[in-house]
C-alpha cells in the first residue's frame, strides 16, 4: 500500500541553529523514507532534506542548516513519503521565517531596587546573543514573591535599537523578595524562547504598613479593675520580611482623654489592667524608616451590654479545609472577628484570631490545625467600634476514632433489668465529636443485641433480660471516623426479686 499522507506539518526556526520541520507520519506498515522539499530565498532557491534515521519517531522530522537559511524569508515546505509501493505528497505549506523564529532566552544579570523609589525593582538583562538584528523583541516578565507559587506576568516590547535592556517592575510590596524570570520572542513570531534562569530581587524596606489589634477581656478582679490582654499582629498583606523595632501603645478612658497612659514594648501582646469604664486603646509599630498607621480598638465598660446577632453557626470539613458558617440577623454587620484555640483543660495559651469582612463564613486549612484536637471557635460581630456577643462552637479539623472507650458501670441489677452507666471520655482522648454511644450486650452462649443512643445520654436501662443469667456488656463511643469500645463488664441477673 502507498504510505500515509504526511499531515500536521509544523516548522520552527531555532534562530541561527536550524530550521526543523516535523509532521505526523501516519501508521506506516513498511519502511518509509521522507523527503522535505523546500523553496526559499523568496522562491528563488529550492532544496531537499531527507530523513536518514531508522527509527520511525526520528523519521518524522528534518532540519535545514545555515548558511541556507536567511531571515526574513518565505518558505514553502512539502513532505514526500516514499515506500516500495510509491510516493505520496503532503499539502504544500507556507511559512514566513519571522513568524516561526525561536531565540534563546535572555539572561537576567541584575535585579535591584532603585534607591528612593518605593515598591519597585529594576530588572536588567542581556538580549539573547543569537537574535535577529532586524527585528524588535517582545518580552514576558513573570514574577512572584518567594513564598508564593502563583506567577504574575507582564508583557512589553523593546525596540531593536534600544540599548537599554531594563524594565522597571512597579506596584510591588515593600521589603519583599521576588523571583523573576524573563522570556522573549521575535515580535512577529508565535514561538517564545524558554524562560531565563530565575533571579531574585528585593524591594526597598518601608515603615511598617499597619497592625491588626484585638483583645481578650477577663473577669473583673476584686478591686474592680479588669485585666485586658491586648494582642496584635502585622496587618494582612504586610511584607513577610517587614521588620519592627517596637510598639507604642496609649490608652485612655472614653470619658477623659487627659488620662492617657503610654507604654512601649517589643512583645506582641500586653496585659493591661483597666478600670470598669470604657477605654480607647491605640498603637503603632515602628522601624528605622518610620511609623505604621495607628490601629485603634475600643474596650467596652464592664456593665456594657453587647449586641447579639448571630443566630446559628456550624462547622464542617470540605476539601482539606475547616469551614465555619453562620447566619446573622443584623444586615449592617459585615466584619467579624474569629478566635480559635485548642480546648484543653488548662488556660488557653495559643489563642489565634483573624478578621473576616463581607462574608459570613471563615475557612482555615486543615493542616494549620492539629488533627484530633478539639478547637473552641468564637465569632464576634463587629459594628464600627462596637464588638458584639460572640457565638461559640467546638470543631475538629480532622476527626479520628476515640483513643479509648467509655468507662462503664452496671447498676440496679434486677431479675430482668439493669442500668448501664458510663462516663464521658476525657477531652484529650476523644479525637472527635462524640456523636453517639452504642451498648452491646449478650447472654452467655446467646445472641448479641445492641442499642445506640445520642451523645447526651450517659446511662441506659436494659430490659427483658433472662433471670439468673450471666451477661457481658460494653459501650462503644463513636465519632464520624468510627468507634472505640470500652472495657467489657460481666453481670448476672437476679433469680428473684423482693417485689415478686
Amino acid at each position: 500500500a502507498l504510505p500515509a499522507k504526511p499531515e500536521n506539518i509544523s516548522c520552527v526556526y531555532y534562530y541561527r541553529k536550524n530550521l526543523t520541520c516535523t509532521w505526523s507520519p501516519g501508521k506506516e506498515t513498511s519502511y518509509t523514507q521522507y523527503t522535505v522539499k523546500r523553496t526559499y530565498a523568496f522562491g528563488e532557491k529550492h532544496d531537499n532534506c531527507t530523513t536518514n534515521s531508522s527509527t520511525s519517531e526520528n523519521r518524522a522530522s528534518c532540519s535545514f542548516f545555515l548558511p541556507r537559511i536567511t531571515i526574513p524569508d518565505n518558505y514553502t515546505i512539502e513532505v514526500e513519503a516514499e515506500n516500495g509501493d510509491g510516493v505520496i505528497k503532503s499539502h504544500m505549506t507556507y511559512w514566513r521565517l519571522e513568524n516561526i523564529a525561536k531565540t534563546e532566552p535572555p539572561k537576567i544579570f541584575r535585579v535591584k531596587p532603585v534607591l528612593g523609589i518605593k515598591r519597585m525593582i529594576q530588572i536588567e538583562w542581556i538580549k539573547p546573543e543569537l537574535a535577529p538584528v532586524s527585528s524588535d523583541l517582545k518580552y514576558t516578565l513573570r514574577f512572584r514573591t518567594v513564598n508564593s507559587t502563583s506567577w504574575m506576568e507582564v508583557n512589553f516590547a523593546k525596540n531593536r535599537k534600544d540599548k537599554n535592556q531594563t524594565y522597571n517592575l512597579t506596584g510591588l510590596q515593600p521589603f519583599t523578595e521576588y523571583v523573576i524570570a524573563l522570556r522573549c520572542a521575535v515580535k512577529e513570531s508565535k514561538f517564545w524562547s524558554d524562560w531565563s534562569q530565575e533571579k531574585m530581587g528585593m524591594t526597598e524596606e518601608e515603615a511598617p504598613c499597619g497592625l491588626e489589634l484585638w483583645r481578650v477581656l477577663k473577669p473583673a478582679e476584686a478591686d474592680g479593675r479588669r485585666p485586658v490582654r491586648l494582642l496584635w499582629k502585622k496587618a494582612r498583606g504586610a511584607p513577610v520580611l517587614e521588620k519592627t523595632l517596637g510598639y507604642n501603645i496609649w490608652y485612655y478612658p472614653e470619658s477623659n482623654t487627659n488620662l492617657t497612659e503610654t507604654m512601649n514594648t517589643t512583645n506582641q501582646q500586653l496585659e493591661l489592667h483597666l478600670g470598669g469604664e470604657s477605654f480607647w486603646v491605640s498603637m503603632i509599630s515602628y522601624n528605622s524608616l518610620g511609623k505604621s498607621p495607628v490601629a485603634t480598638l475600643r474596650i467596652p465598660a464592664i456593665q456594657e451590654k453587647s449586641f447579639q446577632c448571630i443566630e446559628v453557626m456550624q462547622a464542617c470539613v470540605a476539601e482539606d479545609q475547616l469551614v465555619v458558617k453562620w447566619q446573622s440577623s443584623a444586615l449592617d454587620v459585615n466584619t467579624w472577628m474569629i478566635e480559635w484555640f485548642p480546648d484543653v483543660d488548662s488556660e488557653p495559651t495559643t489563642l489565634s484570631w483573624e478578621s473576616v469582612s463581607q462574608a459570613t463564613n471563615w475557612t482555615i486549612q486543615q493542616d494549620k490545625l492539629k488533627p484530633f484536637w478539639c478547637y473552641n471557635i468564637s465569632v464576634y460581630p463587629m459594628l464600627h467600634d462596637k464588638v458584639g456577643e460572640p457565638y461559640s462552637i467546638q470543631a475538629y479539623a480532622k476527626e479520628g476514632v476515640p483513643s479509648e472507650g467509655p468507662e462503664t458501670k452496671v447498676e440496679n441489677i434486677g431479675v430482668k433489668t439493669v442500668t448501664i452507666t458510663w462516663k464521658e471520655i476525657p477531652k484529650s482522648e476523644r479525637k472527635g465529636i462524640i456523636c453517639n454511644y452504642t451498648i452491646f450486650y449478650q447472654a452467655e452462649g446467646g445472641k448479641g443485641f445492641s442499642k445506640t443512643v445520642n451523645s447526651s445520654i450517659l446511662q441506659y436501662g436494659l430490659e427483658s433480660l433472662k433471670r439468673k443469667t450471666s451477661y457481658i456488656v460494653q459501650v462503644m463511643a463513636s465519632t464520624s471516623a468510627g468507634g472505640t469500645n470500652g472495657t467489657s463488664i460481666n453481670f448476672k441477673t437476679l433469680s428473684f426479686s423482693v417485689f415478686e
Epitope: 541561527r16 541553529k17 530565498a41 532557491k45 542548516f65 545555515l66 548558511p67 536567511t70 532586524s134
Partner: antibody, heavy 121, light 107 residues
Framework: QVQLVQSGAEVKKPGASVKVSCKAS????????MNWVRQAPGQGLEWMGL????????DYNPQFQDRVTITADESTSTAYMELSSLRSEDTAVYYC??????????????WGQGTLVTVSS | DIQMTQSPSSLSASVGDRVTITCQAS??????VAWYQQKPGKAPKLLIY???TEAQGVPSRFSGSGSGTDFTLTISSLQPEDFATYYC?????????FGGGTKVEIK
Amino acid sequence: QVQLVQSGAEVKKPGASVKVSCKASGYTFTGYIMNWVRQAPGQGLEWMGLINPYNGGTDYNPQFQDRVTITADESTSTAYMELSSLRSEDTAVYYCARDGYDDGPYTLETWGQGTLVTVSS
Amino acid sequence: DIQMTQSPSSLSASVGDRVTITCQASEDIYSFVAWYQQKPGKAPKLLIYNAQTEAQGVPSRFSGSGSGTDFTLTISSLQPEDFATYYCQHHYDSPLTFGGGTKVEIK
C-alpha cells in the same frame, strides 16, 4: 566586540600540509558560518570553503575539494583550515571570515587579520 | 560556477568625484551581490550586500544597485580614505566567487 585572530605566518615545502587556525571571540561561535578565503600576492580573492560550527557541516570550493579540510572546535571557539599537497601557487594570505547578516547569506562581514603561507623549496 | 566580471580593473579619480564600478554575473543571481573594499596589507571590508543594503557603519556615500546579472557600486563623492581596491562577490550559493577587483587610484 567580534574578533577573529589567526595564527602566525608559515613557510612550507611543496607537498607538505599547513593548518591555519582562527580563534573567534565576542559572539556565539556556533551561531555563525566561518568561511576561508585566500589571496595570492597581487591577485584577487578566492573562496575556499566554509563550516557551520553548530553541526560541523562543510561546503568546499570544488577547486580545493580534494586538498582542503575545514574543522571547528566549539570548546575553544576556533576554526581550522588545513591545506595539503602544497605547491608554490598556494603561496597566499589566508583569511577566515564570519558571515554576519540574517538577510544576506554567504556575505563575509568580519575578517581575520590574515595568515601568510609561503610555499618554497 | 558563477563567474563575476568586474570593470574597470583600475581607475583614476580625484577627491569629490563620483565613481562607478560595475560587475556582471554569468547567470541570473537576483540581488545576491556583495561589495568589499580592501586597502593594502589589510583584510577586505564588507560595504554592501543584497546588491543595495549597506553594511553596518558604512558611510552613505557608498551605494549599490542592480539585479539579475548587472550590478553597480557607486561612490557619490570620493574621499581620500576611499582609495583602495573594490571587489564584487556573488552570495547566491556555493561556491562563492569574486570579481577580479577594481583599483581606485588618485588622479
